[in-house]
């Protein structure tokens, strides 16, 4: 899957664009908004009717090296009485993000963009019921 | 990917940190996956905290299309199919990395950007406090 060129006719390639070898692109990994602290509500994972746990995966050849994955705690959902109701399902919600992968080939190193699927949390769904003859 | 030669003494000159700027292959590894969440599952409709998906498009970004979730209700759907306002539908947010064209409009020059997206919604039971 290639990154699309700017296809809009009103986009003129500026003179200031850096020269880039064919088949590659220049990527600055100094992240925009890196230090922006976002106000993500904490403890949603334990108050949800489809609660989840977090696991940190770490890979020194990936940037960012730390990726957090969620896993649903239950098969069913937690009802008003605090009991698991297995007529409902806790299901993972996933989102794609980009990472940079570093690859070693002998004494050379190369970099590859990669899409990673991250499980961000869980939601409670009503299963579609099918009656089999 | 694009191969970059390392120093002659490469076994000892391993740099654990990533350089600030790298040259990467235009091909993105790992994805012919479906990036439209409406097609990948119908959880957004069947959840007890259902959500609508809004298309956010920006040609200066890769991916140019990102789907943002917005909880449909304030409360959650109960067993009778009614909204129960003793519970809250809340967005699950995630920081993701995208590519931002830098300088703007350049076809092959990007910078990583961190953005916060609402991916879906979940139903939470609030902790109750009684104010004197």
């Amino acid at each position: 899957r290639k990154i699309p060129k700017v296809g809009h006719t009103f986009f003129q390639k500026p003179e200031s664009c850096p020269p880039v070898p064919g088949g590659s692109m220049k990527l600055d990994i100094g992240i925009i908004n890196e230090n922006q602290r976002v106000s993500m509500s904490r403890n949603i994972e334990s108050r949800s009717t489809s609660p989840w746990n977090y696991t940190v995966t770490w890979d020194p050849n990936r940037y960012p090296s730390e990726v957090v994955q969620a896993q649903c705690r239950n098969l069913g959902c937690i009802n008003a009485q605090g009991k698991e109701d297995i007529s409902m399902n806790s299901v993972p919600i996933q989102q794609e993000t980009l990472v940079v992968r570093r690859k070693h080939q002998g004494c050379s190193v190369s970099f590859q963009l990669e899409k990673v699927l991250v499980t961000v949390g869980c939601t409670c769904v009503t299963p579609v019921i099918h009656h089999v003859q | 990917g694009i191969t970059i030669p390392r120093n002659p003494g490469c076994p000892n000159s391993e740099d654990k940190n990533f350089p600030r700027t790298v040259m990467v292959n235009l091909n993105i590894h790992n994805r012919n996956t479906n990036t439209n969440p409406k097609r990948s599952s119908d959880y957004y409709n069947r959840s007890t905290s259902p959500w609508n998906l809004h298309r956010n498009e920006d040609p200066e970004r890769y991916p140019s299309v990102i789907w943002e979730a917005k909880c449909r209700h304030l409360g959650c759907i109960n067993a009778d199919g009614n909204v129960d306002y003793h519970m809250n539908s809340v967005p699950i947010q995630q920081e993701i990395l995208v590519l931002r064209r830098e300088p703007p409009h350049c076809p092959n020059s990007f910078r990583l950007e961190k953005i916060l997206v609402s991916v879906g919604c979940t139903c939470v039971t609030p902790i109750v406090h009684h104010v004197a």
Partner: nanobody
Framework: EVQLVKSGGGLVQPGGSLRLSCAAS????????MGWFREAPGKEREFVAA????????YYADSVKGRFTISRDNAKNAVHLQSNSLKSEDTAVYYC???????????WGQGTQVTVSS
């Protein structure tokens, strides 16, 4: 700790109007939603109306839709419930609530009596 200051309530004739107000204060908190439930004698506490803070969306119980209007004052962290065409079945103790910290905490105010009677 969140404090809720309410005003309004009292006795009103059928077909009349009433305005309830509720303001949240105390420390630093981010509002998720504010609204009202009500409790009539011998009945369970039922939802009346609420407003989501992030986008101002309002929500109503079917029994009050078209007669009650909820609005907010962002600067004062306050909500107002304008009740028109009141009926005897609207008689109840009205409780204001505030949801904070992404909807994870709910603060209940003390009730205010609304009586619709001739």
């Amino acid at each position: 700790e969140v404090q809720l200051v309410k005003s309004g309530g009292g006795l009103v004739q059928p077909g009349g109007s009433l305005r309830l107000s509720c303001a949240a204060s105390g420390g630093t908190f981010s509002l998720f939603a504010m609204g009202w439930f009500r409790e009539a004698p011998g009945k369970e506490r039922e939802f009346v109306a609420a407003i989501r803070w992030s986008d101002g969306s309002s929500y109503y119980a079917d029994s009050v839709k078209g007669r009650f209007t909820i609005s907010r004052d962002n600067a004062k962290n306050a909500v107002h419930l304008q009740s028109n065409s009141l009926k005897s079945e609207d008689t109840a103790v009205y409780y204001c609530y505030a949801d904070v910290q992404g909807g994870l905490h709910r603060y209940w105010g003390q009730g205010t009596q609304v009586t619709v009677s001739s």
